[in-house]
Interface confidence: medium
């Protein structure tokens, strides 16, 4: 019995279905086929869980969190024992193993390993201004999303005809900050933060209005 090489790792957007491949070759009939799918979750590497089981011509549920979401992609028994996981959750991220036994065919590699990573688009980021908006001051524009896998990067754009930030601005796309030094009336306007990762984009807007000093009345 020989389980074929797996693709190594699979990435899927949260909520989308995932197919975990596992195929094998055997010299024996599939009368005594036994397939166990296990997962070692990334969130709890010390606690492997059973995903689904095929034994004695019957299918059995694994851990409760997979109930109703997991099944074999084809009619069993078969040499393709790939499974699907519907409505993937962040907690489904982990290393999946298919263990295949088909007596009397013993020997060879009977385990296939596939990594599953569930990706999450950035949640709507929060935009805020730090510092005084008085003319001549330094301000920091802050942007962060609570969710996002892979970790989002942040891009600030000024929503005018150029879209580029003023020359006095320095941007940190990892932290989501923009520092604008010595703000002037030209710094005023609508700024957009774009949080993005491999599977999604989300934005927030911020209106920076630079305050000019009020002329003092004399006398």
């Amino acid at each position: 019995l020989e389980v074929s090489e797996s693709p190594g790792s699979i990435q899927v957007a949260r909520g989308q279905p995932a197919v975990l491949p596992c195929t094998f070759t055997t010299s024996a009939a599939l009368i005594n086929l036994n397939v166990i799918w296990m997962v070692t979750p990334l969130s709890n590497a010390n606690q492997p869980e059973q995903v689904i089981l095929y034994q004695g011509g019957q299918m059995f549920d694994g851990a409760p969190r997979f109930h109703g979401r997991v099944g074999f992609t084809g009619t069993m028994p078969a040499t393709n024992v790939s499974i699907f996981i519907n409505n993937t959750q962040l907690s489904d991220t982990g290393t999946y193993q298919c263990l295949v036994n088909n007596l009397p065919d013993i020997g060879g590699r009977n385990i296939g390993v596939t990594g599953l990573t569930v990706l999450v688009p950035p949640s709507a980021p929060h935009c805020q201004i730090q510092g005084s908006q008085d003319i001549g001051s330094d301000v920091i524009l802050l942007c962060s999303s609570e969710e996002g896998i892979p970790r989002p990067t942040y891009l600030w754009e000024k929503l005018d005809n150029t879209l580029k930030l003023p020359p006095t601005a320095t941007q940190d796309q990892v932290q989501g900050t923009v520092t604008i030094r010595n703000i002037s009336a030209l710094s005023s306007g609508l700024y957009q933060c774009v949080a993005s990762n491999a599977i999604g984009t989300s934005t927030c807007l911020l209106d920076l209005q630079v305050i000019s000093p009020q002329p003092r009345n004399i006398g």
Epitope: A13, P121, P122, A124, L155, E157, L159, D160, N161, T162, L163, K164, Q192, V194, S196, A198, I199, G200, T201, S202, T203
Partner: antibody
Framework: EVQLVESGGGLVKPGGSLRLSCAAS????????MSWVRQAPGKGLEWVGR??????????DYAAPVKGRFTISRDDSKNTLYLQMNSLKTEDTAVYYC??????????????WGQGTLVTVSS | SYELTQPPSVSVSPGQTASITCSGD??????ASWYQQKPGQSPVLVIY???KRPSGIPERFSGSNSGNTATLTISGTQAEDEADYYC???????????FGGGTKLTVL
């Protein structure tokens, strides 16, 4: 894998209408800003229009040559982008591509692109 | 309306450096992107935000943008780089993309 597949192209008479579809997969479509770009036979690329995600207002913008004739819409439940083309002219003949606005709101470029669908306007 | 100008064609020998320019009024104040299109295929983004490379694009592709000119540089050009290249800028907040006329890169 991020994928975009256009359909709905074909031959139409001047003044006629056509609706193109773009089926998206491999990313969270509802979060994405999407765009249409066209390419006349043997010519360069021409931006047609863009639609923002619903969370960003779902607003649309169009290039001057198509404004008032073309309408971009989206059905997030079907992961599908649409281009409704009315009052078609011979100069609208082109391969129409849908593309995702990536790496930033306005400034990140279009990535990926679909395979394109050919629209021929001729009497 | 905003216009971007590219040379119609550029030739380069394999292994040499190819430079494709794109000019427009105060283009350096805007973001520039570059697309590669091979015959019969869809365009592929190779550079965005002036100089950033999407994942999967080889390191030999680089970009710069200042003044009135954006430049796409392909160092150690390979035969597979032969294609049409289009520059694009962000136009305005209501014009997502303005494209140049395209440059045919020939690898001799």
């Amino acid at each position: 894998e991020v994928q975009l597949v256009e359909s709905g192209g074909g031959l139409v008479k001047p003044g006629g209408s056509l609706r193109l579809s773009c089926a998206a997969s491999g990313f969270t479509f509802s979060n994405a800003w999407m765009s249409w770009v066209r390419q006349a036979p043997g010519k360069g690329l021409e931006w047609v229009g863009r639609i923002k995600s619903k969370t960003d207002g779902g607003t649309t913008d169009y290039a001057a040559p198509v404004k008032g004739r073309f309408t971009i819409s989206r059905d997030d439940s079907k992961n599908t982008l649409y281009l409704q083309m009315n009052s078609l002219k011979t100069e609208d003949t082109a391969v129409y591509y849908c593309a995702r606005v990536a790496h930033g709101g306005y400034s990140g470029g279009l990535d990926p692109w679909g395979q394109g669908t050919l629209v021929t306007v001729s009497s | 309306s905003y216009e971007l100008t590219q040379p119609p064609s550029v030739s380069v020998s394999p292994g040499q450096t190819a430079s494709i320019t794109c000019s427009g009024d105060k283009l350096g104040d805007k973001y520039a992107s570059w697309y590669q299109q091979k015959p019969g295929q869809s365009p592929v983004l190779v550079i965005y935000q002036d100089s950033k490379r999407p994942s999967g694009i080889p390191e030999r592709f680089s970009g710069s943008n200042s003044g009135n000119t954006a430049t796409l540089t392909i160092s150690g050009t390979q035969a597979e780089d032969e294609a049409d290249y289009y520059c694009s800028s962000t136009g305005t907040a209501h014009t997502l993309a303005v494209f140049g006329g395209g440059t045919k890169l020939t690898v001799l």
